[in-house]
Interface confidence: low
Amino acid sequence: NIDVCKLGTVTVQPAPVIPLGSAANISCSLNPKQGCSHYPSSNELILLKFVNDVLVENLHGKKVHDHTGHSSTFQVTNLSLGMTLFVCKLNCSNSQKKPPVPVCGVEISVGVAPEPPQNISCVQEGENGTVACSWNSGKVTYLKTNYTLQLSGPNNLTCQKQCFSDNRQNCNRLDLGINLSPDLAESRFIVRVTAINDLGNSSSLPHTFTFLDIVIPLPPWDIRINFLNASGSRGTLQWEDEGQVVLNQLRYQPLNSTSWNMVNATNAKGKYDLRDLRPFTEYEFQISSKLHLSGGSWSNWSESLRTRTPEEEPVGILDIWYMKQDIDYDRQQISLFWKSLNPSEARGKILHYQVTLQEVTKKTTLQNTTRHTSWTRVIPRTGAWTASVSAANSKGASAPTHINIVDLCGTGLLAPHQVSAKSENMDNILVTWQPPKKADSAVREYIVEWRALQPGSITKFPPHWLRIPPDNMSALISENIKPYICYEIRVHALSESQGGCSSIRGDSKHKAPVSGPHITAITEKKERLFISWTHIPFPEQRGCILHYRIYWKERDSTAQPELCEIQYRRSQNSHPISSLQPRVTYVLWMTAVTAAGESPQGNEREFCPQGKAN
């Protein structure tokens, strides 16, 4: 903002707007009776250059003409693009104390002439929209540049609009505010953009288009779907469109999908039948429109319609497993387990399961419905039993899945051989085996079953299992496998009416146990000592314990202790040792060993045997 100059004037030659690389002469003149009051001859005019309001140069040495005390002319060169402020000041050199006094100032703009606008593109959104064009302005001019958009067409149609670019705003789009109607579909229109600033002007090449070239239909609206007879797989998609639309594109996908199903529909008139939908699935539907079969542009996609298809009756086979436990001499408890159907099989919300237990010969049948994925019943130990389970939703039930109830580990000849369990990584275990050696009936399938070896796991937690075809001899188990936990793994071989099994323990990752077993008692029986202990608490085992070690040494001895290594069995909590001298006091302790190493020692107990030495 240049204020009124009271002391004098500043002028620029050739002009205050110059092309990049040009020089300019700036003249600073004092008004009559202005200047240093006592000594006019001591008037010194200086010119200061400011860029972004920062003083960058005193142009004292650039004087090309000096009319002592009245005016000075300075030549300025190498001006950078944009605006530069020059302020002329009066320096009364006889007074060293007074700072120079501002006289007047001028702003010089350095820029370039505009390039011809290029890449003109025009659109009209919808049949009732208005024509708007955009273009590429080319290099920045650093000057206020006016742009004029001119359109001409049939019947002497002409129309123009203007805008400008400067350092605060950019002009590369204009809306002409006119509407082209479908009755002009075959007509040709021409647009041109002209750019002008203080250093020159330029014009674009003419850009020609027709109605169909530029009109983009509005996206379809009011989308809805009607499912025929509440079908989960067939539906009619309906929508509203502009009147001239002849072609639609439909896309739809389940919400968790990454790829769209695409359909082209000609002359659909706002309606299309879909026949390949998945029941009980959240879908997203979108539609786009075009005004001409071969030319023109597609509209934007419509807003999404999100809806869930109706249910249909479940399909697929339930994966069933069971456990048998004898209660007494004539009763057994059967616990049935099954896995939930996946969504594409359930085809709706499963409301309940129909469970049937049937004794084959006596035709005794127990039936029940449950909302859980397990069911337990007490039945006689006699007879041949079969179980079946089906899943039901609001539209119906799946076909029942049958399984024969056999003695799962009853036939030694069916027991798989050389079962091994190796940790593959933090969350899975590779189980391998060899087929039974002398099976008298063919193996129909293998079942690999596992559960955590923790107190109460049999009653608290259902088993996990995998069904393996009869020609496979390995399984990678990962469901619910956690590191530092020991699992009991059983491999069952099942024939039509018999079962055999082998068992092993395994873990996916292990560490040495946190502590050793706690010795609870030492008793002497028939010249042998029985050591009793409590097992290490489950969280402190940190994997499968392979064996326990019992250490002992004479109380005050510095010699290495003796030790006895016992294979780990969950059911065992005492062990005899017989190599201790009578009437000698010993110190005893225990440790536990996993594949990762040995635990710290458990508690120490002292004991002095009384009997004869062996």
Partner: nanobody
């Protein structure tokens, strides 16, 4: 040597106006570039508006709302503040310099400041 004293601050509703004055002592007031700065709690002092002979300048966020003017006969510089916003709340300082622009360390003389509070 110049002494500066601001006045005119106060509490005002958003959208309201205030006029700050800065009175200077000394006979050479007309030689000095005058500036207004402000400092909100916990923030650095920032340039608001300045007058340098033929040139006035403003920070972008106050352009069109604030106007700086001066009366050399009264040795006073003014800041007219219209359409005030809550973010304009700060202590406003008047400053004088023989050659500075908009950096606060270039100013030689400062007033004590006046509090402006804009409530929403």
């Amino acid at each position: 040597q110049v002494q500066l004293q601001e006045s005119g601050g106060g509490l005002v509703q958003a959208g309201g106006s205030l006029r700050l004055s800065c009175a200077a002592s000394g006979r050479t007031f007309s030689w000095y570039r005058m500036g207004w700065f402000r400092q909100a709690p916990g923030k650095e002092r920032e340039f608001v508006a300045g007058w340098y002979g033929v040139l006035t300048q403003y920070r972008d966020s106050v352009k069109g709302r604030f106007t700086i003017s001066r009366d050399d006969a009264k040795n006073t510089v003014y800041l007219q503040m219209n359409s005030l916003k809550p973010e304009d709340t700060a202590v406003y300082y008047c400053a004088a310099s023989l050659g500075g622009n908009y950096r606060s360390y270039e100013y030689d003389y400062w007033g004590q400041g006046t509090q402006v509070t804009v409530s929403s």
